[in-house]
């Protein structure tokens, strides 16, 4: 029983840095608990952008430093990552897991692009 | 550089209890399962156990459930095997390994260490 | 439990011959890892997400498959190359890996 995972192909930031995706599984088994991570892909180096375990029907909880936030709705995950420039545009990839009760599933998205282009600085005004 | 380092396996005999103890460096330990992987003389590779990242979600093959209990404890860097009523079958090299970032497959390993369970 | 056959048991080969080894589920696999084993030491992984090399591997080493079919290829075998290669699934527990093959020096 594979566990497929749904993503956007591309999504572009908002002019304050914000971009907001879905992250959706098919969940082969009934799990309770299940960890959700973003991680980013971008010349061939693989980093760990946060990650939050959650109850089924609780709300995500990622550490109070993560530039993540999220909301759990039944097999379906919307993440809002905040803060990006435009050095942070590259793959970003929600890997599922289902933690609990055993067996344990994993499934990887392909990827969403996030794009990221950074406000030109407001000109000098005489006002 | 990532590091794992195993001990605590020796002779024992059978019904009787040891703990393994593997000690890891070099990587953020709390962001990664650890697994026990075992080899008996021989023959091929068994997942045993892991622990999940924060310590509280743990899975066990089935052959050891019940008698084998894995623990972690994250300010230490440590993982640990709690084996009880030890059996022949359970002879073999353990391994500490590290889950990988794309899932719980293992990309860095302990040297192993040699339970040998005899009368 | 998923079962993962291995074969051939063993291959006999020569330094600069191409080895092709098969690994086999018996149920659909969502992500496969291959890993080379030489005696007295631990695994060190190859291949995950059955064609990804992982840090540090030569790229006479590949792998390609899917479904319930994989491969882990060297293409020209060098003299280190001669060791026992595992395939494990890691897609849901619990984890199993192939019985191995053996490339041993013709």
């Known amino acids: 029983k594979a566990m497929h995972v749904a993503q956007p192909a591309v999504v572009l930031a908002s002019s304050r840095g914000i971009a907001s995706f879905v992250c959706e599984y098919a969940s082969p088994g009934k799990a309770t608990e299940v960890r959700v991570t973003v991680l980013r892909q971008a010349d061939s180096q693989v980093t760990e952008v946060c990650a939050a375990t959650y109850m089924m029907g609780n709300e995500l909880t990622f550490l109070d430093d993560s530039i993540c936030t999220g909301t759990s709705s039944g097999n379906q995950v919307n993440l809002t990552i905040q803060g990006l420039r435009a050095m942070d545009t590259g793959l970003y990839i929600c890997k599922v897991e289902l933690m609990y009760p055993p067996p344990y599933y994993l499934g990887i998205g392909n990827g969403t692009q996030i794009y990221v282009i950074d406000p030109e600085p407001c000109p000098d005004s005489d006002f | 550089q990532v590091q794992l380092v195993e001990s605590g396996g020796g002779v024992v005999q059978p019904g009787r209890s040891l703990r393994l103890s593997c000690i890891a460096s070099?990587?953020?330990?709390?962001?990664?399962?650890m697994h026990w992987v075992r080899q008996a003389p021989g023959k091929g590779l068994e997942w045993v156990a892991v622990?999940?990242?924060?310590?509280?979600?743990?899975h066990y093959a089935d052959s050891v459930k019940g008698r084998f209990t894995i623990s972690r404890d994250n300010s230490k860097n440590t993982l640990y095997l709690q084996m009880n009523s030890l059996r022949a079958e359970d002879t073999a090299v353990y391994y500490c390994?590290?889950?990988?970032?794309?899932?719980?497959?293992?990309?860095?390993w302990g040297q192993g260490t040699l339970v040998t369970v005899s009368s | 439990e998923i079962v993962l056959t291995q074969s051939p048991g063993t291959l006999s080969l020569s330094p600069g011959e191409r080895a092709t080894l098969s690994c086999r589920a018996s149920?659909?696999?969502?992500?496969l890892a291959w890993y080379q084993q030489k005696p007295g030491q631990a695994p060190r992984l190859l291949i995950y997400?059955?064609?990804s090399r992982a840090t540090g591997i030569p790229d006479r080493f590949s792998g390609s498959g899917s479904g319930t079919d994989f491969t882990l290829t060297i293409s020209r075998l060098e003299p280190e190359d001669f060791a026992v290669y595992y395939c494990?699934?890691?897609?849901?527990?619990?984890?199993?890996f192939g019985q191995g093959t053996k490339v041993e020096i013709k």
């Open positions: 070099g990587f953020t330990f709390s962001s990664y399962g």
């Open positions: 494990q699934q890691y897609g849901s527990s619990p984890w199993t």
């Open positions: 997400g059955a064609s």
């Open positions: 622990n999940w990242y924060d310590g509280s979600n743990k």
């Open positions: 149920q659909s696999v969502s992500y």
């Open positions: 390994a590290r889950g990988g970032v794309w899932g719980p497959y293992f990309d860095y």
